[in-house]
């Protein structure tokens, strides 16, 4: 199109994360995808100073079609904050990200204590949990809820029926798979929820309950229906 | 049947390089983070490396930090170990060790399945 | 580092006799979930270490009853309550908290 545009983000979401604490030797990707007209050029800052491939042992990528910088087998003095500029002759963005290089003993995912937390809420009603991790090594998170099948919670092999319900995926942000929200609530959404997270050294996980009370002014019509009788 | 396979191991000179494989069968390799171990002769049991599922995480022990690079290709169920300047105190048994998965837990997260193990000597 | 300690060296039993093996971690292995991560093998000759009790008390799969894992935080054991002549070789704990994951020196057990 002839429709001249100063450079703009194309994707925030990818940029939201801006504190990078990544393990030592392992690889950082910063991403900028950006969009305008003509198409813009991008290029990197350390520290607020241009970023050349002599300034690290073994150099850096740049993916110019992914907008994104590529550091592999980082070590202590990459730390620092990267700066990409996108710009073309109609203006310029640019957008930093802080990189901490973790040379601590990196260890299996930490759940804080009490979360998440047992909940009660009327049928229709709406519930949240909340898990908070924290993991040197980037942790994948589940949100699991244990099932009946054919009335029993366990299988014929003594393991728990799962059913995932929310894990974390390409659009998913760590604040959002931190949080499962459960609408408009059932009497079948009550029982036990667990919290997941795994990472390269292991796998953690919390559970709380959920209970389901009958809504106010329902209960005769509760009482009188057999699939709510003990 | 869940099974771990190294090869690659030999005898080589200080200095030198080696590359290990291990080749996974029996579960989804890709769900799982994997280990090296190594055991020198008569000596006890020496963690070495851990990479997670994906390949985006790495750690190392002290003693092959610089030299030794695991790395893994999930599309041939194959885990790596290259050995750079090797050492004589490098001399073991390398076996291959599964990590943790991505899933619930049905038992051990991981450390349960081990190679039979591939014999390095570093020699001159 | 977490530094593991094992006691005894090695161990003679009189088969159908009890044998107890310490392992002692210079950290607490309590982890935040509430589970403790150590975790117990035994390698017989010429073969890879074999799980026997992961998560300070579960028996694995396969794993005799006779084998039980107890302790907390620090401290930990083995037991076997009878031992029978298969239960030869070396046995291991680790701890599975932290990266580098450390093993205990090993404790070799033999029959009289």
């Known amino acids: 199109s002839n429709n001249k545009r100063a450079p703009y983000w194309t994707n925030t979401e990818k940029m939201e994360k801006r504190l990078h604490a990544v393990p030592a030797a392992n690889t950082v990707k910063f991403r900028c995808p950006a969009g305008g007209n003509p198409m813009p050029t991008m290029r990197w800052l350390k520290n607020g100073k241009e970023f050349k491939q002599e300034h690290r042992i073994g150099g850096y990528k740049v993916r110019n079609q992914h907008w994104s910088l590529i550091m592999e087998s980082v070590v202590p003095s990459d730390k620092g904050n990267y700066t990409c500029v996108v710009e073309n002759e109609y203006g310029s963005i640019n957008h930093t990200y802080h990189l901490d290089v973790v040379e601590r003993s990196p260890h299996r995912p930490i759940l804080q204590a009490g979360l998440p937390a047992n909940a009660s809420t009327v049928v229709g009603g709406d519930v949240e949990f909340v898990c908070k991790v924290y993991s040197d090594a980037q942790p994948h998170i589940q949100w699991i809820k244990h099932v009946e099948k054919n009335g029993s919670k366990y299988g014929p092999d003594g393991l728990p029926y799962l059913k995932v319900l929310k894990a974390a995926g390409v659009n998913t942000t760590d604040k959002e798979i931190e949080v499962l929200y459960i609408r408009n609530v059932t009497f079948e959404d009550a029982g036990e929820y667990t919290c997941l997270a795994g990472n390269s050294i292991g796998i953690s996980f919390h559970s709380a309950w959920l209970t389901v009370l009958p809504a106010p002014g329902r209960e005769k019509e509760i009482t009188a229906s057999p699939d709510y009788l003990e | 049947e869940v099974q771990l396979l190294e090869s690659g191991g030999g005898v080589v000179q200080p200095g030198r390089s080696l590359r290990l494989s291990c080749a996974a069968s029996?579960?989804?390799?890709?769900?799982?983070?994997m280990h090296w171990v190594r055991q020198a002769p008569g000596k006890g049991l020496e963690w070495v490396a851990v990479i997670s599922y994906d390949g985006s995480n790495k750690y190392y022990a002290d003693s092959v930090k610089g030299r030794f690079t695991i790395s893994r290709d999930n599309s041939k169920n194959t885990l790596s170990l290259q050995m750079n300047s090797l050492r004589v105190e490098d001399t073991a048994i390398y076996y291959c060790v599964r990590g943790a998965g991505r899933g619930y837990p049905y038992g051990p997260d991981g450390f349960d399945i081990w190679g039979q193990g591939t014999m390095v000597t570093v020699s001159s | 580092d977490i530094v593991m300690t094992q006691t005894p060296l090695s161990l003679s039993v009189t088969p159908g006799q009890p044998a107890s093996i310490s392992c002692t971690s210079s950290r607490s292995l309590l982890h935040s979930d509430g589970k403790t991560y150590v975790y117990w093998y035994v390698q017989k000759s010429g073969q890879p270490p074999q799980l026997l009790i992961y998560?300070?008390?579960n028996r694995f799969s396969g794993v005799p009853d006779r084998f039980s894992g107890s302790g907390s935080r620090t401290d930990f054991t083995l037991k076997i309550s009878r031992v029978e002549a298969e239960d030869v070789g070396v046995y291991y704990c680790?701890?599975?908290?932290?990266?580098?994951?450390?093993f205990g020196g090993g404790t070799k057990v033999e029959i009289k």
């Open positions: 998560e300070l008390s």
């Open positions: 680790m701890q599975y908290v932290e990266v580098p994951l450390t």
């Open positions: 029996g579960f989804t390799f890709s769900s799982y983070a």
